[in-house]
Amino acid sequence: KEEQISFRDCAEVFKSGHTTNGIYTLTFPNSTEEIKAYCDMEAGGGGWTIIQRREDGSVDFQRTWKEYKVGFGNPSGEYWLGNEFVSQLTNQQRYVLKIHLKDWEGNEAYSLYEHFYLSSEELNYRIHLKGLTGTAGKISSISQPGNDFSTKDGDNDKCICKCSQMLTGGWWFDACGPSNLNGMYYPQRQNTNKFNGIKWYYWKGSGYSLKATTMMIRPADF
């Protein structure tokens, strides 16, 4: 029997025996199109597909709709995997979403959603979340019910303003809402009282811009 050489996500990579963190080539569901993703094979049992990472401000996250659709950055550093791939993947089966956060004081926290998926591009990659647990706030910092995705050239928020232009970055903005993990990266001692930083309100409050963030997904039945 021929060995499987295409993987849909990092959980399949892990189950095939590749248990080392790193960049792996994944294949779009029902397609031969490929995408490179970082796989975390250690945290919480491994098999996590990293869909977003911020850590040093080296990558500009004020990008277009198309760039957020296909992804940008470097999977070994700061990057966005791509809304189209994540949408297709999370509509194939049930996925969980884990968001890992670091502040500038050495603290870490996470939010875990037991069910996560993105609608199609026709529905503006609207985010759907259920079942929040974790240490980064008892209330979801991603507004519920989920909002459409917005970018600087694709304004789908509920604000009289254009949240993506005002806060920078593409995100599931409300008006504008309690979070934006794709905001401007601010260094230590310049990270408070920021109107457009990397925000997760129900952990660090208003105006606090985080040091590092990772968004990762894995099948619920892993």
Partner: nanobody
């Protein structure tokens, strides 16, 4: 850098008055709304009053309507909260905070707490005889 500095707090007898000031720097009031919030020991932070300098719109919580007046002096980049007929239940640390004025949901007039991204350190108001 964005900074908000409150002043004017202190000890006052019931029925007395105080005027709090919120001096803003790093941005101009024209493009922002300023809110006054308060937090009493063991209680949640609550909105008291807010102003959008550009349109002159104001907001007051029911508990302070008719007693508190918010105003702004854009030339000084300062917002004031005139507090009259003070009651013991007004005792709290008072904070001012800023939000870009345009960050408004369609059909709404004011902003949820999490939209205020810049905060001062607070000034203590104690109402006691």
């Amino acid at each position: 850098d964005v900074q908000l500095v409150e002043s004017g707090g202190g000890l006052v007898q019931p029925g007395g008055s105080l005027r709090l000031s919120c001096a803003a720097s790093g941005f101009t009031l024209d493009d922002y709304a300023i809110g006054w919030f308060r937090q009493a020991p063991g209680k949640e932070r609550e909105g008291v009053s807010a102003i959008r300098s550009s349109g002159g719109s104001t907001y007051y919580a029911d508990s302070v309507k008719g007693r508190f007046t918010i105003s702004s002096d854009n030339s000084k980049n300062t917002v004031y909260l005139q507090m009259n007929s003070l009651r013991p239940e007004d005792t709290a640390v008072y904070y001012c905070a800023a939000v870009p004025a345009g960050r408004l949901r369609f059909g709404e007039q004011w902003y949820p707490l999490y939209e205020y991204d810049a905060w001062g350190q607070g000034t203590l108001v104690t109402v006691s005889s």
